[in-house]
Interface confidence: low
């Protein structure tokens, strides 16, 4: 189920799958929620540690049992991923951090009158992931009111420094507040050029697009269908970026599909999950568990309830079935996507719905005049 | 909201506007989305207007002037007013609205978490009141949703300021000694929310106060934690399943 409590002065030992710098525990928790394997996290605020390299450190952790030993560490904050937490799952992070400089690649500098305007500029710039703003009282006069738009390879700061009269924050694109607008079109038989930032296997272009939308550096994508001429590239989803923010060229190419990230959509973003079930398809991955269940929908529910399960295959082979129940293979991988996609099998596959934010699950632990 | 500032899109996605359509249509009260099909508000919003057909509930909006005849709204299936609420008193000023159709959650329309039953131990230091109500005592409904940061005050302190009224344990007060920031007419039924451990919780329902934002006259809110049993009972008995965001 959903666990929202935070543990003050506690640090989870072991289980590290990734680390990064984040300005606070809530942002660290959000990164954990969206990381395919993270179940637990520990965060070290600046006040909790003398080691400059580990200040603002966010450590994402996995555990086969779903828990890790807690050690006492003054100032540290630990907690759980919000996978399975229904409507609390959101990549939107509005907070502005005073006295903090989030470092990254500075690609744009302009003078603005407020930190809110700086955040707006970041939100309205296709490449901006986070920003820093030097206030009116910054010690170097020439930098005052400077708004620095930034990005980094992982979408999080490359370093975070305590610095007076500087305020930092993140783009509000994941809040569906970008004024840029988005291209909803899917372009059949068209391949985009430019830089590949990641490669995953997906069953269709729509899953590819959702993964692109929630990848920090993906601006557009090309998907190679299951009838693409090169067998090793079938079902490959290439996540892409470019300096300009749009593809510099596109090539007509049979059995490819291209499109854009939907992160810049205004008012509606796709859910960070994939609910479709794919008949006749087998998703390969690391086996987490095998259980007998009645029907593919129950298999998907079982996967969703098992927090580490990322995707599943429900087999309809006679040898995999007992009366009305058949084998439900619960699987996972390093990146959350199948390691192999096979067609023409007797069965169906699909994804866990643990990141769907429409769940109804109960997720909130934690003489006069009327008006 | 007196002394407030404009909110931005999706900042308070649980805030709804309760509007009445008679000859004209107007905003009367706020409310808080607590589940796909449930809104929590103040009982006094329905004083003299208990007919569910006249009400329109707008969710996922920021600016009332954006509402046109084509703007989607929810209609009421059922109004559940607390059985002990009396029009002449300020006690038990709480009501549940069951919507005719469930709402989908988006970044701009999602529920607020409810507190734990009888939550008295949590010390809330970051509390906000929101609404489209008057910006001064003799004011008018605001177009853009307003927000204001107001500290909670103890019930003893609040009782000192309201000698003629009983401030019960089922109420919570918020305000500045010097005044200047407060809820006002039209904010009724809306949320008093507090952020604790990174999570927003519905601590109070805007209920009453002496004028608006007056010195040493805090706003009085219905304390949601004290009504958790009632909320759970009503939402579960209505359709056999808890439909709101209750504590795990």
């Amino acid at each position: 189920g959903c666990l929202t409590q935070l543990y003050e002065n506690a640090f989870f030992r072991g289980g590290d799958v990734a680390s990064m710098y984040t300005p606070n525990a809530q942002y660290c928790q959000m990164r954990c929620t969206f990381h395919p394997r993270c179940l637990l996290f520990s965060f070290l605020p600046a006040s909790s540690i003398n080691d400059m390299e580990k200040r603002f450190g966010c450590f994402l952790k996995d555990s086969v049992t779903g828990t890790l030993p807690k050690v006492h560490r003054t100032g540290a904050v630990s907690g759980h991923s919000l996978k399975q937490c229904g409507h609390q799952i959101s990549a939107c992070h509005r907070d502005i951090y005073k006295g903090v400089d989030m470092r990254g690649v500075n690609f744009n500098v302009s003078k603005v009158s407020s930190v809110e305007e700086c955040q707006k500029r970041c939100t309205s710039n296709i490449r901006c992931q986070f920003f820093s703003y030097a206030t009116q009282t910054f010690h170097k006069a020439e930098y005052r009111n400077n708004c620095l738009l930034k990005y980094s390879p992982g979408g999080t700061p490359t370093a975070i420094k305590v610095l007076s009269n500087v305020e930092s924050g993140f783009s509000l694109k994941p809040c569906a507040l970008s004024e840029i607008g988005c291209h909803m079109n899917i372009f059949q038989h068209l391949a985009f050029s430019d830089v590949d930032v990641a490669r995953v296997l997906t069953p269709d272009a729509f899953v590819c697009r959702t993964i692109c939308t929630y990848h920090p550096n993906c601006l557009f994508f090309t998907f190679y269908t299951n009838v693409w001429k090169i067998e090793s590239q079938r079902n490959v989803c290439l996540l892409k970026t470019s300096e300009s923010g749009t593809p510099s060229s596109s090539t007509p190419q049979e059995n490819t599909i291209s499109g854009y990230s939907l992160l810049t959509c205004k008012r509606t973003l796709p859910e960070p999950c994939h609910s479709k079930i794919y008949p006749g398809v087998d998703f390969g991955g690391e086996e987490l568990n095998v259980t007998f269940v009645k029907g593919v929908n129950v298999c998907q529910e079982t996967c969703t309830k098992m927090i580490r399960c990322q995707f599943f295959t429900y087999s309809l082979l006679p040898e995999d079935c007992k009366e009305e129940k058949c084998k439900c293979f619960l699987r996972l991988s390093m990146d959350g996507s199948p390691t192999r996609i096979a067609y023409g099998t007797q069965g169906s596959s699909g994804y866990s719905l643990r990141l769907c934010n429409t769940g109804d699950n109960s997720v909130c632990t934690t003489k006069t005049s009327t008006r | 909201i007196v002394g407030g500032t404009n909110s931005s899109w999706g900042e308070w996605p649980w805030q709804v506007s309760l509007q009445v359509k008679l000859t004209a249509q107007r905003h009367l009260c706020g409310g808080s989305l607590i589940g796909h099909q449930w809104v929590l508000t103040a009982a006094h919003c329905f004083d003299g207007l208990p007919l569910q057909d006249v009400w329109r509930i707008y969710s996922g909006i920021l600016n009332l002037s954006d509402i046109t005849k084509d703007t989607p709204f929810s209609q009421i299936k059922e109004i559940i007013i607390h059985q002990n609420y009396k029009v002449s008193e300020g006690n038990h000023d709480i009501a549940l609205i069951k919507l005719q159709a469930p709402l989908n959650y988006t970044e701009f329309q999602k529920p607020i978490c409810l507190p734990s039953k009888g939550d008295t131990s949590t010390i809330y230091t970051n509390c906000w009141v929101t609404g489209w109500g008057f910006s001064k005592e003799k004011g008018e409904i605001q177009n853009i949703l307003q927000k204001v940061n107001i500290p909670l005050v103890t019930n003893e302190e609040c009782q000192k300021r309201y000698q003629d009224y009983k401030i019960t344990q089922r109420m919570v007060c918020a305000g500045y000694k010097e005044g200047g920031k407060d809820a006002c007419k039209g904010d009724s039924g809306g949320p008093l929310v507090c952020k604790h451990n990174g999570m927003w919780r519905l601590v109070g329902i805007t209920s009453w106060g002496e004028g608006c934002a007056r010195r040493e006259q805090p706003g009085v809110y219905t304390k949601v934690a004290e009504y958790m049993d009632w909320i759970l009972e009503k939402t579960q008995s209505s359709d056999g399943k808890a439909q709101m965001q209750s504590p795990a």
């Epitope: 809110e116 707006k120 500029r121 004024e179 607008g181 749009t246 593809p247 205004k266 | 002037s65 046109t68």
Partner: antibody, heavy 122, light 106 residues
């Protein structure tokens, strides 16, 4: 009826200033990105500046950056263009425009005002 | 910045002729292109948006095609009311107009 009505044009000397207004009616002004587009006598159309619905984000063509300021008053349903340090090449008919539908930033302009003439000459 | 180049700059044609105007973008703009018609002393009038979508109320003799960097406006059978100046406009990155094509009577 949807209408845009520009005003404030006239003759001004090089280096001078002028403020154009565009009064909007018949639609919810505060929803839309608004634009200024100009057309020099006998020449083509040139996009000058745009302002997003909230007024918080403004964009300018390189030719006017630092000299022109676009603003809006949603309560008055009015769009403005403050033009400073005017040059002879700013002489043009100035139109305000917007698009009734479509996703912001992906906008064609299907509603135009009738234009106001600005002449910069000594 | 994205530059838009229209050709030809002037086109002489007769009523009933099929007329084609081209517009080239300096970089890919996908389908984010509009075509306008303007008559002397009047504001421009939107004909086509998203490269090929006909604006409501515009006669079906007008059509648009293309994507990426190459776009075309076609008038299948020129009518007396069609003698005017035509502009293309990109809105992929901010807004830029082509320099215009004047369609005059031969």
């Amino acid at each position: 009826e949807v209408q845009l009505l520009e005003s404030g044009g006239g003759l001004v000397q090089p280096g001078g200033s002028l403020r154009l207004s565009c009064a909007a009616s018949g639609f919810t002004f505060s929803h839309y990105i608004m634009m200024w587009v100009r057309q020099a006598p006998g020449k083509g159309l040139e996009w000058v500046s745009g302002i997003y619905s909230s007024g918080g984000i403004t964009v300018y063509a390189d030719s006017v950056k630092g000299r022109f300021t676009i603003s809006r008053d949603n309560s008055k349903n009015t769009l403005y263009l403050q033009m400073n340090s005017l040059r002879a090449e700013d002489t043009a008919v100035y139109y305000c425009a917007y698009r009734r539908t479509g996703v912001p930033r992906r906008d064609e302009f299907d509603i135009w005002g009738q234009g106001t003439m600005v002449t910069v000459s000594s | 910045d994205i530059q838009m180049t229209q050709s030809p700059s002037t086109l002489s044609a007769s009523v009933g002729d099929r007329v084609t105007i081209t517009c080239r973008a300096s970089q890919s703009i996908s389908s984010w292109l509009a075509w306008y018609q303007q008559k002397p002393g009047k504001a421009p009038n939107l004909l086509i948006y998203k490269a090929s979508t006909l604006e409501s109320g515009v006669p079906s003799r007008f059509s648009g095609s293309g994507s990426g960097t190459e776009f075309t406006l076609t008038i299948s059978s020129l009518q007396p009311d069609d003698f005017a100046t035509y502009y293309c406009q990109q809105y992929n990155t901010y807004w830029t107009f082509g320099q215009g094509t004047k369609v005059e009577i031969k």
